[in-house]
């Protein structure tokens, strides 16, 4: 039975240029984690494997950072990167756990003026 | 228990292509967190070529991108690497590994032997 949570930072906003971590946590379990794969809609950014270790695509190997723990830092933000990020936590023996993040990334002036993503 | 067993390796001459194939057999397990390729050559450490996800995301190595594909048919618990261009530095064991969603550890299959010659 599946009893553990993912906790992730949510909803976030950064400005062009800068960086963010993201971060994901399960929690009320026992359950050993085996691997964490982070996804940004149709790609595979990264893996942490508990055997393996860590593996960055190459696609973002300049801008992405393993780290801190199992989060993810990306770094060189542009406009594109705006939008969903998950953490796949698979685990034994409860199974996979997945988290989802919302990034927007905001123009550096717009940042500046206070604006910040929100779901009603 | 989980078996690798790869197949496909063999002798190919510089410029050519091969495909190899890693079939889950056993107890097999119904989603996988990755399985991937990995070589070996002689003196020099384990290098990571390529990996699927069970939901056919991939990532490759720099030094195969563009040149390697891997992809996977989940009915027959098999994955594959189509491997193209091949040079004489690609010369090693190659070896697939898996993490099945619902094991504690990875699985490794035995190694198939890849020569190019020039």
């Known amino acids: 039975m599946m009893t553990g949570t993912i906790e992730t930072t949510g909803n976030i906003s950064a400005e062009k240029g800068g960086s963010i971590i993201l971060q994901c946590h399960l929690s009320s379990t026992t359950a050993q984690v085996t691997q964490v794969n982070w996804e940004q809609q149709d790609q595979l950014l990264a893996i942490c494997n508990a055997d393996l270790g860590w593996h960055i695509s190459p696609s973002f190997k300049d801008r992405v950072a393993p780290g801190p723990g199992l989060g993810l830092t990306l770094q060189s933000l542009t406009v594109n990167d705006t939008g969903e990020y998950f953490c796949i936590y698979h685990t034994y023996p409860d199974g996979t756990y997945t988290g989802r993040i919302f990034l927007e990334v905001l123009e550096s002036s717009v940042a500046e003026h206070g604006a910040r993503f929100q779901i009603p | 228990e989980v078996q690798l067993v790869e197949s496909g390796g063999g002798l190919v001459q510089a410029g050519g292509s091969l495909r190899l194939s890693c079939a889950a057999s056993g107890r097999t397990f119904s989603s996988y967190a990755m399985m991937g390729w990995f070589r070996q050559a002689p003196g020099k450490e384990r290098e990571f070529l390529a990996i699927i996800t069970d939901g056919s995301k991939t990532l490759y190595a720099d030094s195969v991108k563009g040149r390697f594909t891997i992809s996977a048919d989940n009915a027959k618990n098999t994955v594959y690497l189509q491997m193209n261009s091949l040079k004489p530095e690609d010369t090693a064991v190659y070896y697939c590994?898996?993490?099945?969603?619902?094991?504690?550890?990875?699985?490794w299959g035995q190694g198939t032997q890849v020569t190019v010659s020039s």
């Open positions: 590994a898996a993490q099945f969603t619902l094991a504690r550890h990875l699985v």
